[in-house]
């Protein structure tokens, strides 16, 4: 089996208030089975940004169709950026487990920061 890698190509993403930000994440393998989630920050206080399998995230859309059985692109778009959205975003692969899924591998993170205001 090819070992799964989480690829977040941008270390830094400069965004503009009011605009939409795209956070990229691809995986190199579909296995082990389990969902991909997005978080801001690390540790027990990290904030869930998007959960592939459940939940309502009105400002978040996926770049690709996650219902494709061979999908390896878990990039997301966050709309209507505000200063409160700055931080480091991680895409995280979980492997299935009972009763809870188990964190398997995290991407290196993308820091979202505010760029210059539009003129």
């Amino acid at each position: 089996e090819e070992e799964l890698q989480m690829i977040q190509p941008e270390k830094l993403l400069l965004v503009t208030v009011g605009k939409t930000a795209t956070l990229h994440c691809t995986v190199t393998s579909l296995l082990p089975v389990g969902p991909v989630l997005w978080f801001r920050g690390v540790g027990p206080g990290r904030e869930l940004i998007y959960n592939q399998k459940e939940g309502h995230f009105p400002r978040v859309t996926t770049v690709s169709d996650l219902t494709k059985r061979n999908n390896m692109d878990f990039s997301i778009r966050i709309s209507s950026i505000t200063p409160a959205d700055v931080g480091t975003y991680y895409c995280v692969k979980f492997r299935k487990g009972s009763p809870e899924n188990v964190e398997f591998k995290s991407g290196p993170g993308t820091e979202m920061a505010l760029g210059a205001k539009p003129s």
Epitope: E1, L30, L31, P32, V33, P35, Q52, K53, E54, D65, L66, T67, K68, R69, N70, K96, S98, P99
Partner: antibody
């Protein structure tokens, strides 16, 4: 409430074609992958085909690849199964099913009976 | 191929376990589907190994470990008489498969 209503079944002769439909309501159809599953008389369930939410990706079991085509029209909240070159072995109740995020099934249609007989 | 027993029986109130083997834990998710009569619409009682839809009674539970999944009915009732099919999705092949079905008889 989620509702899936299968239709289009009937009696056909070997070699003929049939198009099944599944009308969906009670959920955002365009957000879900869908599948067709059949059950031959006295037999178990057999998955036939699946389609992604956007309709661009399709998947088939080997025994129907090239004969059956799954498609969808998200503007009509409808799923289809075009079945060509039918044989007696295709006689079954055909169900549409909504897929979960990991391609299992959470809701099923009531089924439509297809009989292939000379 | 998924393997499950052809039949199981129990008295009302007993606990019933139906096993399904043949999948690879690393690449497989399991579901369980109840069919009360041939040709009637299946009802999903468990998906994603252990997730119970909100309209399914709590006496139904699921688990998976190694190459097998288990459906447990705790305090079985007469209305639970049905054929139970295990199903699996294999992330390696992108294919869904089903077991042959287990007939549950409540004595």
């Amino acid at each position: 409430d989620v509702q899936l209503v299968d239709s289009g079944g009937g009696v056909v002769r070997p070699g003929e074609s049939l198009r099944l439909s599944c009308a969906a309501s009670g959920f955002t159809f365009s957000s879900y992958a869908m599948s067709w599953v059949r059950q031959a008389p006295g037999k178990g369930l057999e998955w036939l085909a699946g389609i992604s939410a956007g309709g661009s990706d399709t998947y088939y079991i080997d025994s129907v690849k090239g004969r059956f085509t799954i498609s969808r029209d998200n503007s009509k909240n409808s799923l289809y199964l075009q079945m060509n070159s039918l044989t007696a072995e295709d006689t079954a109740v055909y169900y549409c099913a909504r897929e979960t995020w990991n391609h299992l099934f959470d809701y099923w249609g009531l089924g439509t009976l297809v009989t292939v007989s000379s | 191929a998924l393997t499950q027993p052809a039949s199981v029986s129990a008295n009302p109130g007993e606990t019933v376990k139906i096993t399904c083997s043949g999948g690879d834990y690393y690449s497989t998710y399991y579901g369980w589907y109840q069919q009360k009569s041939p040709g009637s619409a299946p009802v999903t009682v468990i998906h994603s190994d252990d997730k119970r839809p909100s309209d399914i009674p709590s006496r139904f539970s699921g688990s998976a470990s190694g190459s097998a999944a288990t459906l447990t009915i705790t305090g079985v009732r007469v209305e639970d008489e049905a054929v139970y099919f295990c199903g699996a999705y294999d992330g390696r092949t992108y294919i869904n498969t089903f077991g042959a079905g287990t007939t549950l008889t409540v004595l």
